[in-house]
């Protein structure tokens, strides 16, 4: 922590400008009051201030608003937002999408991960839910951003605006995200075609169920096998192989290349060795002929 | 454009590890697999094993298994693969390949790492 | 694993000849699952043909691929200079994944 001196008459600050960067630490301070600079914080990122310098300065706001920043503030921290902690940017109440922007322009290049997701999320509470404006602001100035919210969050996500939300946008979407948004992409695209349905839902099958799985490989989509690796094991493993060898269509002979790798893998193991041995691709691992397989699950489950 | 831009080279002792990373631009990360390919001082090339990116799933060639481990980091659309308990025949320019999932040829390859294993 | 051995070793033409490079694998390859490389000096490899015959994307026609089983091959129609280079076999019908050794054309 910054020690307190009284400020020399000389250093007394009236306005926010250049000559504060020949301030020292501990001049900074004595000498800049807080509430001023709260008022005249447009003028900051325009200073080419150090980093030691900007600490205190974060120091002097931490001192006015230990509840937390208010948006007039935040809107204009400039790169004094690369100062700010998760736990410090948990404290604000973000309403204005030109705030998220301009913090998530100079966040970009920076480690900044955990405090881009807790903004994000901060706005989405701020603003009740994720509307289309915030999606398509995070789609444009953070492409991969929408997958830092929670599964809690990303529920407020009506329907109607999946649409605008692009491949590269769900790239680093987990399962459980997955889970939640592949029923909003359904309906939301129930109306379409087959075969420009597949191509809408196709980076929100991560969250698909069996059945919806099983009923794509009766529409000749030829799935990728990009797509089919990102499905649910839990999701892949009741596929039979005529099943997968229709759902993935001309795209069959990669899971050859891909049979070391799961959900591959743990779906060759539940097959029957004639029954991959059909598909003429050396697959091996099936259960082989005249095998019986208990469900044991199932007697526990009963008794 | 696609792009494959690997770290730089590398200086090790015997019996110390290194890490090797691969930031991939230009492309969806999670549709292609990343191979690591390596190749000794006017030798061939030999296959270390891959990582897909979507799963965190990696498969590795045997020769290198326990020493090897591949690691992805889809929020900065970056592989790393670390190879420990160097040994001088380490030595070799290592290479991060990108494989369109369900393919197992390389169509994008980084630039090369040199690794240099030395007492 | 499957042992693909490349030959010749060396192959020494002149700009303008037929260059037939050689791949033979130890057990038989999906022929799917065949590709050649070329890579130059302080280069990294680059992708020739995929699919055994397959031509890689910006790849002149004068390269060609073909074969099946244990028997592949690599053709340049008519050699200009810039294909003076190393190129390499690789398989991956069978893992591990495996590279041939390489064949080095060179000016004669």
């Known amino acids: 922590d910054v020690e307190r001196t009284t400020c020399p008459p000389e250093k007394e600050v009236h306005e926010i400008d250049e000559s504060l960067i020949f301030y020292k630490k501990r001049e900074l301070e004595a000498c800049v009051d807080a509430a001023l600079l709260a008022a005249q914080m447009d003028r900051v990122d325009a200073i080419p201030f150090t980093y030691e310098q900007l600490d205190v300065l974060k120091h002097k706001l931490d001192e006015l608003y230990p509840q937390g920043y208010p948006e007039s503030v935040i809107r204009h921290l400039g790169h004094l937002f690369l100062k700010m902690s998760p736990e410090d940017i948990r404290k604000w109440n973000v309403t204005s999408l030109e705030t998220l922007k301009a913090l998530l322009k100079v966040s970009k290049g920076h480690e900044m991960s955990a405090q881009v997701a807790t903004l994000i999320d901060r706005v989405v509470v701020g603003r009740g839910q994720l509307d289309k404006d915030t999606v398509d602001t995070l789609t444009a100035f953070c492409p991969g951003c929408l997958c830092s919210l929670s599964p809690e969050r990303l529920s407020s996500v009506p329907p109607s605006v999946i649409g605008a939300v692009r491949p590269q946008d769900l790239d680093t979407c987990g399962p459980r995200q997955l889970d939640v948004l592949y029923p909003k992409a359904r309906l939301a695209f129930q109306n379409m075609s087959g075969s420009e349905y597949f191509v809408k839902i196709r980076p929100f099958l991560g969250g698909a169920p069996t059945e919806d799985v099983k009923a794509l490989s009766q529409q000749n989509v030829s799935m990728d096998l990009a797509t089919f690796m990102k499905l649910r094991r839990e999701a892949v493993l009741p596929l039979t192989v005529a099943e997968v060898q229709k759902l993935l269509g001309p795209h069959v002979e990669g899971l050859k290349v891909e049979e070391q790798h799961s959900p591959v893998r743990d779906w060759i193991l539940k097959q029957r060795q004639d029954d991959l041995d059909t598909l003429g691709l050396g697959l091996q691992g099936g259960i082989p002929n005249g095998y019986l397989i208990l469900d044991l699950s199932v007697r526990e489950a009963l008794s | 454009e696609v792009q494959l831009v690997q770290s730089g080279a590398e200086v090790k002792k015997p019996g110390a590890s290194v890490k090797v990373s691969c930031k991939a631009s230009g492309y969806t990360f999670t549709d292609y697999n990343m191979d690591w390919v390596r190749q000794a001082p006017g030798q061939g090339l030999e296959w270390m094993g891959d990582?897909?990116?979507?799963?965190?799933?990696?498969i590795y060639n045997q020769k290198f298994s326990g020493r090897v481990t591949m690691t992805e980091d889809k929020s900065a659309s970056t592989v790393y693969m670390e190879l420990s308990s160097l040994r001088s025949e380490d030595t070799a320019v290592y290479y991060c390949?990108?494989?369109?999932?369900?393919?197992?040829?390389?169509?994008?390859w980084g630039q090369g790492t040199t690794v240099t294993v030395s007492s | 694993e499957i042992v693909l051995t490349q030959s010749p070793a060396t192959l020494s033409l002149s700009p303008g000849e037929r260059a037939t490079l050689s791949c033979s694998a130890s057990?038989?390859?999906?022929?799917?699952?065949l590709s050649w490389y070329q890579q130059k000096p302080g280069q990294s490899p680059r992708l020739l043909i995929y699919r055994t015959s397959n031509l890689a994307s910006g790849i002149p026609a004068r390269f060609s691929g073909s074969g099946s089983g244990t028997d592949y091959t690599l053709t340049i129609s008519s050699l200009e200079p810039e294909d003076f280079a190393v190129y390499y076999c690789?398989?991956?019908?069978?893992?591990?994944?495996?590279f041939g050794g390489g064949t080095k054309v060179e000016i004669k």
């Open positions: 690789h398989q991956w019908s069978s893992f591990p994944y495996t």
């Open positions: 390949a990108r494989r369109r999932i369900g393919t197992g040829y390389f169509d994008v």
């Open positions: 057990s038989s390859v999906i022929s799917s699952y």
């Open positions: 990582i897909n990116p979507s799963t965190g799933g990696t």
